[in-house]
């Protein structure tokens, strides 16, 4: 005898509004096998029974959720197979607020997924992304779940909202963040994503007011690693240890980016370096105040920047650009930081 169920999975996820057929069949050496579905809610699909097989048709309504069991018998032998059916709703209906983000403002962003089922926090997860990485430094506020207003009666759908408080987006700001909503079902992971554009200011870069010399620019773990010979600079939020005062870099997306090194021993000299193969050049493109007032040395894949006359580095944004490609790395140097050989 052979007993087969197709599809063979013990858990099946069915999109709302789509139909699914589950065929249960059994061959029998002596005579015809008896096959039938049991444990069926009266509303759960329809069954077509043929000699040696039974076909369960699920209509993809939320009421179709259940666990039917196929029972096959041949003489004195019997087999059974249960199938947990989960009907889900996850249309691409994400709404984000605000419509765009403004750099330099403490702000809350919300992301709402509409017409969802099941409305289970264990099934549905939200993420705020910078590029392909989770945004570091955002604070998740409490999620909200509300029933959608239904035109027709039936099992209700829900909308789920996640809000985040954002760190400052810095300058130059990333072009956009993305809200990503993932529904995790048996043997199925579905994802929708919605862009939240960042308003690109034409004015000169100015970080928000801070009361102390703290790093505040958001970073993502996809940004380039910056190495320093003095005060530690890092863009890998998951890799401790971290300095007590750490400027942070924010790199644009790209396959290979320049790295900024900060040397305290050399009287606050910055070195921008590219290691992306031959023919690459780097240059300083932004510094607090007038770039012309700084001492610059450029030599192909390396560019140095220092203060004239020698003194503490000015608080603000420094940017280094790499060509060809135009990838940039930005470093924010906090104010009121004095060189310290022990740091």
């Amino acid at each position: 005898q052979s007993f087969q169920v197709n599809p063979p999975e013990s858990e099946v996820a069915v999109a709302m509004g789509t139909s699914l057929q589950i065929t249960c069949s059994m061959s029998c050496d002596e005579g015809v096998a008896r096959v039938h579905w049991r444990g069926l809610d009266t509303s759960l699909g329809s069954v077509q029974t043929l000699p040696g097989s039974s076909i369960l048709s699920v209509r993809g309504m939320l009421s179709d959720t259940g666990t039917p069991v196929c029972v096959g018998s041949c003489g004195s032998r019997s087999f059974q197979h249960s199938v947990k059916i989960l009907v889900y709703a996850f249309p691409d209906q994400l709404v984000v607020s605000p419509e765009f983000l403004v750099p330099g403002q403490d702000q809350v962003v919300s992301c709402t997924a509409h017409n969802i089922w099941p409305a289970d926090p264990n099934s549905l997860s939200f993420a705020l992304l910078l590029g392909e990485q989770r945004l570091e430094g955002a604070q998740a506020l409490e999620p909200e779940q509300e029933e959608e207003i239904q035109e027709a009666e039936g099992t209700p759908l829900f909308r789920m909202t996640q809000r985040w408080r954002l760190p400052s987006l810095g300058t130059p700001a990333p072009p956009a963040l993305h809200c990503q909503v993932t529904m995790q079902l048996p043997k199925l992971v579905l994802t929708h994503r919605k862009e939240i554009p960042v308003l690109q200011s034409q004015t000169s870069p100015k970080p928000p007011n801070t009361t102390s010399a703290e790093p505040y620019i958001l970073t993502s773990s996809s940004t380039a690693e910056a190495v320093s010979t003095g005060l530690n600079i890092t863009t890998l939020p998951s890799a401790p240890p971290y300095p007590k005062l750490s400027p942070r870099t924010l790199s644009s997306e790209g396959p290979c980016r320049p790295k900024i090194h900060q040397d305290l021993e050399a009287g606050w000299e910055l070195l921008c370096e590219a290691s992306c193969g031959p023919g690459v050049t780097v240059r300083w493109t932004l510094a607090p105040g007038d770039l012309a007032t700084y001492h610059k040395r450029e030599a192909g894949a390396q560019a140095w920047l220092s203060v004239l006359p020698p003194g503490p580095m000015v608080e603000g944004w420094f940017q280094c650009r790499q060509d060809p490609g135009g990838e940039v790395t930005n470093l924010y140097v906090p104010g009121q930081v004095t060189p310290n050989s022990s740091s």
């Epitope: 430094g137 604070q139 998740a140 506020l141 809000r163 408080r165 760190p167 505040y216 939020p237």
Partner: antibody, heavy 119, light 107 residues
Framework: EVQLLESGGGLVQPGGSLRLSCAAS????????MHWVRQAPGKGLEWISY????????NYADSVKGRFTISRDNSKNTLYLQMNSLRAEDTAVYYC????????????WGKGTTVTVSS | DIQMTQSPSSLSASVGDRVTITCRAS??????LAWYQQKPGKAPKLLIY???SLQSGVPSRFSGSGSGTDFTLTISSLQPEDFATYYC?????????FGQGTKVEIK
Amino acid sequence: EVQLLESGGGLVQPGGSLRLSCAASGFTFSDFWMHWVRQAPGKGLEWISYISGDGGYTNYADSVKGRFTISRDNSKNTLYLQMNSLRAEDTAVYYCARDRPYYYYMDVWGKGTTVTVSS
Amino acid sequence: DIQMTQSPSSLSASVGDRVTITCRASQSVSRSLAWYQQKPGKAPKLLIYAASSLQSGVPSRFSGSGSGTDFTLTISSLQPEDFATYYCQQYKSYPVTFGQGTKVEIK
């Protein structure tokens, strides 16, 4: 100097109400989200509520939801906590705390005011 | 909710000792963790934020480390004024939650 000063605590019977205030000075009050945190006698710290700088966002711990209301008057640089249907387990020192923009830790705390719920 | 568990609950130490307190989160909080010091009858005082950044005015003998779920507060050389209760707090997501506290007592 940045300062927070709570007031309004006292002895109240179960089921009663009390309104706590927190006067802020030394900083631009409306720029900061604010919190209420409490500490029962001999116990640890428990966050109970926050309010955003403009008052548009509020949230509460499950233990006080539906009974406590947080509000603020930015023109008076004052944070409030209206406490209704008080229970014995609400007995605690209540602190207001300032939330650091872009980082979200509580960087400045008031000295606290004591609320005792007892018959 | 994210649970924060501190260990030990209390410890006895002498002036000059190196003291380590650990804090474990029930799920990752990235680096969104702060440490506070509280003395009897006083409000909590911020020591460390972002897991390892020292708050302005806090002595450098205090340091923090860790990321994700495991964090440590270290006092390199305990001073008489350091005898107090220390709390960790995650602020990655709401509700923000505190550890149960670690009381540092004089041996």
